[in-house]
Interface confidence: medium
């Protein structure tokens, strides 16, 4: 019968021939009676047989991540007969796995959004990487995830390359943070390899700001002969959160003689002093009257960021008209 | 150190003209709106005019619309009052006065300078 | 125009004493648009109290505003040596009108 080991070859050789293993029969008694061949994909061209001796050589440098196991054939032939030996048997060689691969994020480029002052632990996104090296090899494929910029706000999961918040952070301040991640082979031990990926996080607005009075006091002045209605002029406070967070609404907070009114401009998000009564310049001709500034929606959780809300004083002038 | 000083004042016939500086100092001029004010035996403290942070806005009490005129200059850190045709009934001790942010009484005055019209 | 009067003309009181001055305006003061000062001989008047009750900064708590609409009422809980001098109240509801003042001065 046929007597053989499991054939291994490492890959990437560099040697012109390197000695895999040898194929005999048991009837062969080394006298160089029988004949050896070899069959098969890659048979001569890969890997070649001594006739004589059955030994088996690889003649060119292997890939395991192209090709990890190569099936030939064995024949043994009396050279006085020109008879088979042993029926031709089917073989396997094997080609084992060297650490020759980087670990390779193959879903980049990596892109995430995440509310701001999202509390430390938050999950922002999941990077995976992938090795081409055998995974049943030692740690050849086994990676280990770590964080080269993006501390102190983010931190990853070493094993899952789960990336989480580590730390607050305020839209207002920065609105998007480039993490950047290393996937290393070899569990992180001498010859690894390593990979990176860069990780676009970008801050979503929360409500965490009040609008606040650009000015402590508006000067204004109104013409006696003003109708109720008139717009007198407009005050402005300004909002460092975007979008429907930064939608505010005025109104009066104290005006004793209630002669005015304050309406909002949603659009440009101006208040706008409304003469709600007539003045008279012999009654009175100047006012003070104090105006408040909130945000439209402010979510319940968010109430902490919006207690007291900014106030200021416009003074009115009233202009005298020449009365007939 | 914050404060207002008035100059200018003195002895002048009456129809005559005068005019009061006042310099400030220490405080951020030209965010406040500032005011004449004077002060007679006969009838105390009278407002006179006042002037927006910016002059944008000038208004005077009736009994010197048309004569006095009320000026800044914020680069100066200087405000200003031009008397003209001036009467003995404007006799007084003039100061200026610095309005607060939130209303209009005065937080901070000067020491005033006298302003005798006398034939 | 708002008038202020003021009573007493003057008030005549020991160091240590509690002092009241009045300042009634001829019609309603908008918002409590009232303030009172302090004028020493020689010296510009000092802002004590605005909006009838507020006491301005550096104020001693001695010394207290109140009421609206058009009575008025200035307060010095003891008085001291400093506090001799003439006080004025001044409406700025509407336009500016000043009191014509309440002398305190040492019995």
């Known amino acids: 019968g046929w007597v053989w080991n499991q054939f291994f070859v490492p890959e990437e050789m560099n040697t012109t021939s390197h000695h895999i293993g040898q194929l005999r029969s048991d009837l062969d008694n080394g006298n160089n009676s029988f004949q050896y061949k070899l069959l098969g994909a890659g048979a001569g061209s890969t890997f070649i047989i001594d006739e004589r001796t059955g030994d088996i050589y690889a003649i060119q440098k292997l890939d395991r991540e192209e090709r990890s196991l190569y099936i030939l054939r064995a024949q043994v032939i009396d050279i006085a007969t020109g008879r088979a030996v042993e029926p031709e048997s089917e073989f396997v060689i094997k080609v084992s796995d060297i650490n020759d691969n980087e670990p390779k994020f193959l879903d980049e480029p990596y892109e995430a959004i995440v509310p701001e002052m999202s509390p430390e632990g938050t999950l922002v996104i999941q990077v995976t990487a992938s090795d081409a090296d055998d995974p049943s090899s030692g740690n050849n494929a086994r990676l280990l995830y770590s964080l080269l910029q993006g501390q102190p706000y983010f931190s990853v999961e070493p094993t899952t390359g789960v990336i989480r918040i580590s730390s607050k952070m305020d839209r207002e301040l920065q609105d998007e943070y480039w993490v950047i991640i290393q996937a290393k082979d070899m569990i992180g031990q001498p010859g690894a390899l390593s990979g990176t990926t860069s990780v676009l996080i970008k801050l979503s607005d929360v409500n965490d700001n009040k609008p606040i009075f650009k000015e402590s006091l508006y000067r204004l002045t109104v013409s006696e002969s003003a109708p109720t209605g008139t717009s007198i002029g407009t005050i402005m406070a300004y909002d460092n959160d975007i979008g429907e967070n930064a939608e505010m609404d005025y109104s009066i907070e104290e005006d004793d003689s209630q002669t005015f009114d304050i309406i909002t401009n949603h659009e440009t998000q101006e208040g706008i002093v409304i003469l709600k009564k007539k003045v008279d310049f012999e009654h009175q001709n100047h006012y003070g009257i104090r105006a408040k500034v909130k945000n439209h929606h402010v979510p319940e959780q968010l109430m902490k960021y919006h207690t007291e809300a900014s106030t200021t004083f416009i003074k009115i002038q009233v202009e005298d008209v020449d009365e007939p | 150190q914050v404060q207002l000083v008035e100059s200018g004042g003195g002895v002048v016939q009456p129809g005559r003209s005068l005019r009061l500086s006042c310099a400030a100092s220490?405080?951020?001029?030209?965010?406040?709106?500032m005011d004449w004010v004077r002060q007679t035996p006969g009838k105390g403290l009278e407002w006179v005019a006042v002037?927006?942070?910016?002059?944008?806005?000038?208004y005077y009490a009736d009994s010197v619309r048309g004569r006095f005129t009320i000026s800044r200059d914020n680069s100066k850190n200087t405000l200003f009052l031009q008397m003209n045709s001036l009467r003995v009934e404007d006799t007084a001790v003039y100061y200026c006065?610095?309005?607060?942010?939130?209303?209009?009484?005065?937080?901070?005055w000067g020491r005033g300078t006298l302003v005798t019209v006398s034939s | 125009e708002i008038v202020l009067t003021q009573s007493p003309g003057t008030l005549s009181l020991s160091p240590g004493e509690r002092a009241t001055l009045s300042c009634r305006a001829s019609?309603?003061?908008?918002?409590?648009?009232l303030a009172w000062y302090q004028q020493k001989p020689g010296q510009a008047p000092r802002l004590l109290i605005y909006g009838a009750s507020s006491r301005a900064t550096g104020i001693p708590d001695r010394f207290s505003g109140s009421g609206s609409g058009t009575d008025f009422t200035l307060t010095i809980s003891r008085l001291e040596p400093e506090d001799f001098a003439v006080y004025y109240c001044q409406q700025y509801g509407s336009s500016w009108t000043f009191g014509q003042g309440t002398k305190v001065e040492i019995k």
């Open positions: 019609q309603s003061v908008s918002s409590s648009y």
């Open positions: 002037i927006w942070y910016d002059g944008s806005n000038k």
């Open positions: 006065a610095r309005e607060t942010g939130e209303g209009w009484y005065f937080d901070l």
């Open positions: 220490g405080f951020s001029f030209s965010s406040y709106d």
